[in-house]
C-alpha cells in the first residue's frame, strides 16, 4: 500500500482541519487507514481520524482541533494497520481556509438600491473575526454570461448596489465567499446562493 499524493491540509481556524490525499490504487479509506494527529504541546493527547473515501483512490479526513492559535503545530502520521505510510506536520495558522459566510440576504425595498447582508461565520473572540474580507458573485439565472464579482474590501458584511446596474425584470442569484489576507488564506467555499427578482423600473423619459 502506497501514498501517491501526500496529505495536504487546510484549517477553518476555529475547530476543524481537513486533510486530503491520494493512494496508489483503489482503497477503502475507512477500513484500511487511520490518520493520527497530535498537538506539539507538553503532555498533549493523541487523536485519531477515520478517513472517508473521496473517489476510488482519494481519502479525506476531518480533524477536530480545539482552540486553534497561531503557534499550534501538529504531527501527522498516516497508518495502514501497523505500517506507517507517511509522517508530516501541519501548522493550521499557515493553511487557513475560512468558513463560508452565512445568512446571505438580499433586501430589494431600499429605494432603487439592492442591499446584500450576510454574517461573519466566526465568533467575535476568534482571530479571524476582524480579518475577513469578501467577494460577492451576482449572476443572471437565465444568462450565464451576465455575471459579476464585487470585491468587498472592508470588514462590514454588507454590499449596496444600484438596482439599475442589473437588468430589469430578471431573476438574479447571489453568493458570497471570504478570505483573510493577513493569514495568506485561500478563499472560503461560496455560501449558499439566494435568489431575488429585480423589479427595478427604468424611470420614464420625457422627450
Amino acid at each position: 500500500m502506497k501514498v501517491l499524493q501526500e496529505p495536504t491540509c487546510v484549517s477553518d481556524y476555529i475547530s476543524l482541519s481537513t486533510c486530503e490525499w491520494k493512494m496508489g490504487g483503489p482503497t477503502n479509506c475507512s477500513a484500511e487507514l487511520r490518520l493520527v494527529y497530535q498537538l506539539v504541546f507538553l503532555i498533549s493527547e493523541t487523536n485519531m481520524c477515520v478517513p472517508e473515501n473521496n473517489g476510488a483512490a482519494g481519502c479525506v479526513c476531518h480533524l477536530f482541533m480545539e482552540d486553534m492559535v497561531g503557534a499550534d503545530n501538529y504531527t501527522l502520521d498516516l497508518w495502514a494497520g501497523q505500517q506507517l505510510l507517511w509522517k508530516g506536520s501541519f501548522k493550521p495558522s499557515e493553511h487557513v481556509k475560512p468558513k463560508a459566510p452565512e445568512n446571505l440576504t438580499v433586501y430589494t425595498n431600499v429605494s432603487e438600491t439592492l442591499l446584500l447582508t450576510w454574517s461573519n461565520p466566526y465568533p467575535p473572540d476568534n482571530y479571524l473575526y476582524e480579518k475577513l474580507t469578501y467577494a460577492v458573485n451576482i449572476w443572471n439565472e437565465n444568462d450565464p454570461t451576465d455575471s459579476r464579482i464585487y470585491d468587498v474590501t472592508y470588514q462590514e458584511p454588507t454590499l449596496r448596489i444600484a438596482a439599475s446596474t442589473l437588468k430589469s425584470g430578471v431573476s438574479y442569484r447571489a453568493r458570497v465567499r471570504a478570505w483573510a489576507q493577513s493569514y495568506n488564506s485561500t478563499w472560503s467555499e461560496w455560501s449558499p446562493s439566494t435568489k431575488w427578482y429585480n423589479a427595478y423600473k427604468e424611470p420614464f423619459e420625457k422627450h
Epitope: F41, L42, E66, D67, V69, A71, N73
Partner: nanobody, 119 residues
Framework: QVQLQESGGGSVQAGGSLRVSCAAS????????MAWFRQAPGKEREAVAS????????YYADSVKGRFTISLDNAKNTLYLQMNSLKPEDTAMYYC????????????WGKGTQVTVSS
C-alpha cells in the same frame, strides 16, 4: 521578560491535599502554554500538567491523572496546581514554567517550591 514565582509548598501526610501557586509578572507574552514540572532528588525533571491559557484546556501526566488539577486565574495572572490524594512518590520540588509560542512550555521558569509527602 516574564517572572514566575511559586508558593504554597510544604509538608503533608499521605492522602492529604495541597495547593501550590505560581504568580506571573512582567510580559504576558507567555500566554501560549503554562505548566507544572517536578523534580525528585536524584531524578530527572518531569512534566506534571500543562494548560492552554486561552481555552483552559488541560493535560496531565498519567501518574497524576485524576488526583491533580491545573488551573489558571487570568485576572490574577496566577497558575495553580491542586494536589489531592498525595503519595510519598509525589515528594519533589515543583516548578512553574511558561512559553509564548513553544509547545514544550519551557521558555520561562520559576525557582520552585518544595512539596514533601510523608507516609
Amino acid at each position: 521578560q516574564v517572572q514566575l514565582q511559586e508558593s504554597g509548598g510544604g509538608s503533608v501526610q499521605a492522602g492529604g491535599s495541597l495547593r501550590v501557586s505560581c504568580a506571573a509578572s512582567g510580559s504576558t507574552s507567555y500566554r501560549y502554554c503554562m505548566a507544572w514540572f517536578r523534580q525528585a532528588p536524584g531524578k530527572e525533571r518531569e512534566a506534571v500538567a500543562s494548560i492552554r491559557p486561552r481555552s483552559g484546556r488541560a493535560y496531565y501526566a498519567d501518574s497524576v491523572k485524576g488526583r491533580f488539577t491545573i488551573s489558571l486565574d487570568n485576572a490574577k495572572n496566577t497558575l495553580y496546581l491542586q494536589m489531592n490524594s498525595l503519595k510519598p512518590e509525589d515528594t519533589a520540588m515543583y516548578y512553574c514554567a511558561a512559553s509564548d509560542n513553544d509547545g514544550n512550555c519551557q521558555d520561562y521558569w520559576g525557582k520552585g517550591t518544595q512539596v514533601t509527602v510523608s507516609s
